[in-house]
């Protein structure tokens, strides 16, 4: 299958998201809350491999003097804005006393700007991608991922945080959007719909896909997520659309097969390490990119979004498992956990390939309406 006016190459996919959780000191997970496989301290200790980011948080990276590359997560919740025709009605929300940013839900009160003023910002995510209006930018080189192939041990933490399923990623997963634009992966999570109802966050010419994966990254220029929030390029999210294909996706099955264990909100399990890059499309060269925000409170802006042109294929059964297994708070199913698309407000989406050129025979004179802003890079 192809994206509307987009080319899909090979079915693979992956994603993560720290964007779905607000940051704040109050939300730092405690050691007691989150037992995890970590490096013990000591003479032979390997620095920085021990602290895993916590489930509902974006990790903070400790200074090298303490532990090289060590990550801990701080809670980043998610919010929903009204107005989407397929707006989610699910009640997923977190209610932590003293933490306003954790009290929100999809498709209802409180209004997200009340949870976090940034949610009313001008440059929010997700957005509708219109390939014909995207600016072809040859300077956008293929993404580079390093260290995403993980051995089965130590295991990784998979958690139902009430608004998504999130896999906490260990230190050492490096991603480069280009020269000098280097990031470390923190976590990945998914967004989905319900039976017969698609649930991707981004859309393409108004078309919503069954689901979407987000892999959330922190710029290496910052030691902690809270330092990077709101800073241009401080966070970067790789996003890929998931759609139905004829075969089971073996990479996703390693996670989906464990969802029953974490059906209850707040529950978690340990899963063997896996090839995280196998959750993503195989074509790292064709993508759309724009600057937006976290798609949940605190909705911090300055997030670089990279949306793959190629989709990831999952079987119908796998997509059903994703949308029909987890529960949120208040005995409500965890479904339709996506935010409505937000206005571009003058932003231009860039493409790493000539997306505006329709390869179909009907397109006589394709027009590229916007030019690349980064042409001189």
């Amino acid at each position: 299958q192809r994206l509307p006016r987009m080319q899909e190459d090979s079915p693979l996919g992956g994603g993560s998201s720290g964007e779905d959780d607000p940051l704040g000191e109050e939300d730092l997970p405690s050691e007691e809350d989150s037992p995890r496989e970590e490096d013990p301290p000591g003479e032979e200790d390997l620095p920085g491999e021990e602290d895993l980011p916590g489930e509902e948080d974006l990790p903070e990276v400790k200074p090298k003097s303490e532990e090289e590359g060590s990550l801990k997560l701080e809670d980043l919740p998610t919010v929903e804005a009204p107005g989407d025709p397929q707006e989610p009605q699910n009640n997923a929300h977190r209610d932590k006393e003293g933490d306003d940013q954790s009290h929100w839900r999809y498709g209802g009160d409180p209004p997200w700007p009340r949870v976090s003023p940034a949610c009313a910002g001008r440059f929010q995510s997700p957005v509708d991608i219109r390939p014909q209006l995207a600016a072809f930018c040859p300077a956008l080189r293929p993404l580079e991922l390093l260290g995403f192939q993980l051995p089965p041990l130590p295991e990784l933490r998979l958690r139902n945080n009430g608004h998504s399923v999130q896999l906490t990623l260990p230190p050492g997963l490096e991603m480069a959007l280009g020269p000098g634009r280097e990031y470390r992966a923190l976590q990945l999570h998914l967004h989905w719909g319900a039976a017969g109802r698609p649930g991707s966050e981004h859309t393409v010419e108004g078309h919503r896909f069954p689901a979407e994966i987000h892999v959330v990254h922190l710029s290496t220029a910052f030691a902690r997520v809270d330092e990077a929030l709101g800073r241009p390029g401080g966070l970067a999210v790789l996003a890929a659309f998931l759609e139905e294909g004829p075969e089971e996706n073996s990479a996703y099955e390693q996670l989906l097969s464990r969802l029953e264990e974490i059906a209850e909100e707040g529950s978690e399990t340990q899963v063997p390490g896996l090839d995280i890059s196998a959750l993503l499309p195989s074509d790292f060269s064709r993508y759309f990119q724009y600057e937006g925000s976290l798609t949940t409170p605190p909705c911090a802006q300055g997030v670089i979004w990279t949306v793959f042109n190629q989709t990831v294929m999952l079987s119908a059964k796998q997509l059903h498992t994703l949308s029909d297994t987890l529960w949120g708070p208040g005995d409500s199913r965890l479904q339709l956990n996506f935010r409505a698309t937000q206005p571009l407000n003058g932003r231009v989406i860039e493409a790493s390939f000539p997306a505006g050129v329709d390869s179909s025979p009907r397109a006589a004179e394709p027009v590229q309406l916007n030019s690349c802003l980064a042409a001189g890079d």
Partner: antibody
Framework: QVQLVQSGGGLVRPGGSLRLSCAAS????????MSWVRQAPGKGLEWVSA????????YYADSVKGRFTISRDNSKNTLYLQMNSLRAEDTAVYYC????????????WGQGTTVTVSS | QSVLTQPPSVSGAPGQRITISCTGS?????????VHWYQQVPGKAPKVVIY???NRPSGVPDRFSGSKSGASASLAITGLQTEDEADYYC??????????FGGGTKVTVL
């Protein structure tokens, strides 16, 4: 002080059994995956078996599959290797090691215990 | 026969730079799994000197460095010192669900 203290090695006849123990201290043992690695006399290192932090998942080298069993008792901070149907080629120094490094390295090692299989 | 291939021995004079190679395959190093290096002094347990291809644990001199390219990796020791005399092993993970080691390289300081 972070350490792994091993015990249980010794001389055993072919076909016999032995149980090795590895007591951990100085770190939250129950949060870490663990492995056994062995080294035959004058030879290199060979990974033998591994176990997840909660003990729910185990892995074995083909050479010991069906004969060795790895287990752990997190309440006692102890790792075990039950070795049955021992063969002469199992003669080696056995090390327990911590699989805590997310890049896949073994970062903490026990002092080693010698297992000799001979008639 | 070890899954990862290392030279049996490497030697150098004090102050020299030596490198130890480690060659794997598409099911281990070439599959993207990291390479780690251990130093083992006779009669002692191994000790990590490089993890994750090129990271040095605290306490390991910066004379030790690692690199990886494709299905191969290498360990370099610059400014070789007498205390560096030991056996060195590379290690990775293999898709066959096993952790794998190289056969070891004996480093001699002349």
């Amino acid at each position: 002080q972070v350490q792994l203290v091993q015990s249980g090695g010794g001389l055993v006849r072919p076909g016999g059994s032995l149980r090795l123990s590895c007591a951990a201290s100085g770190f939250p043992f129950s949060s870490y995956a663990m492995s056994w690695v062995r080294q035959a006399p004058g030879k290199g290192l060979e990974w033998v078996s591994a176990i997840s932090a909660n003990g729910g998942t185990t892995y074995y080298a083909d050479s010991v599959k069906g004969r060795f069993t790895i287990s752990r008792d997190n309440s006692k901070n102890t790792l075990y290797l039950q070795m049955n149907s021992l063969r002469a080629e199992d003669t080696a120094v056995y090390y327990c090691a911590n699989n805590g490094n997310y890049r896949g390295a073994f970062d903490i090692w026990g002092q080693g215990t010698t297992v000799t299989v001979s008639s | 026969q070890s899954v990862l291939t290392q030279p049996p021995s490497v030697s150098g004079a004090p102050g020299q730079r030596i490198t130890i190679s480690c060659t794997g395959s598409s099911s281990n190093i070439g599959a993207g799994y990291d390479v780690h290096w251990y130093q083992q002094v006779p009669g002692k347990a191994p000790k990590v000197v490089i993890y994750g291809n090129n990271n040095r644990p605290s306490g390991v001199p910066d004379r030790f460095s690692g690199s990886k390219s494709g299905a191969s990796a290498s360990l370099a020791i610059t400014g070789l010192q007498t205390e560096d005399e030991a056996d060195y092993y590379c290690q990775s993970y293999d898709k066959s669900l096993t952790w794998v080691f190289g056969g070891g390289t004996k480093v001699t300081v002349l």
